[in-house]
Amino acid sequence: LPAQVAFTPYAPEPGSTCRLREYYDQTAQMCCSKCSPGQHAKVFCTKTSDTVCDSCEDSTYTQLWNWVPECLSCGSRCSSDQVETQACTREQNRICTCRPGWYCALSKQEGCRLCAPLRKCRPGFGVARPGTETSDVVCKPCAPGTFSNTTSSTDICRPHQICNVVAIPGNASMDAVCTSTSPTRSMAPGAVHLPQPVSTRSQHTQPTPEPSTAPSTSFLLPMGPSPPAEGSTGD
């Protein structure tokens, strides 16, 4: 004979557990129904009556099958430097994600609590380590033979051109100026060469974090308010 299906609430067999989407109520000592995502337990079960569930109120949620007495509060609204990538509903919490040009300075379990603007390296300094989702740009002074003439969170130090005849010598923030018609690019120590992306628009490039490998390109287009440029100390 097939085993009878027990309807909640029911007393479990000794040593057995309650079924999926059920929980054991210690007070009633019965297996009782959980509430579905988007709901919470309004009235707990007894020996004779099952759990009574109710919908979560506005700005609260439950993501899992549960028997909590109150739904969880959604996180605060996203700030102006964030995008709401997941809305607060009865079944899910709000997720805020930093806008381009910002990184997450204080993470949450999901999304970001506090965003900060990516540092911009000033002329004479280039990107030593690019920004990531959770770390800022690291700038370094341009080594001899290289320069950066931009204030940017993505530009690296580039090699000076080599002139047959130098009109103006290059420095950390300016390329050399040649009188010759056919300058070449130096292969100065520490200079980094990046292949340019195929694009008619100006395109920033970003070195890969590993210092031992030749950098490749990724597409990073910062936006938002300009944070302070990297100071002359290079820190």
Partner: nanobody
Amino acid sequence: EVQLLESGGGLVQPGGSLRLSCAASGRTFSSLFMGWFRQAPGKEREFVASIRYPGLITNYADSAKGRFTISRDSAKNTVYLQMNSLRPEDTGVYYCAAAPTGRAFNYWGQGTQVTVSS
């Protein structure tokens, strides 16, 4: 390394439709969120839509709700933005973006131009 390449932009009349595509290569499709942003001439880049994977949870800017639909085809490593009932104010460069852990959009494509004009 993540690379994103948008396509599908063009000139369309008001009320018309376009479907933008964003082909992803590298680690992108383990990204928690993919999104579309746009930048109109002389304006800041603004959020249009995002999609979470897995679960395919979507979110839209108010200006896109009811007209635009974001979708994702993991088999083709592509994210789409279906744009209907286009208006002149939808004109701009549309960028695809990735937020690998959902904390910050730090990977970007080069953009595709959308012009809505009669």
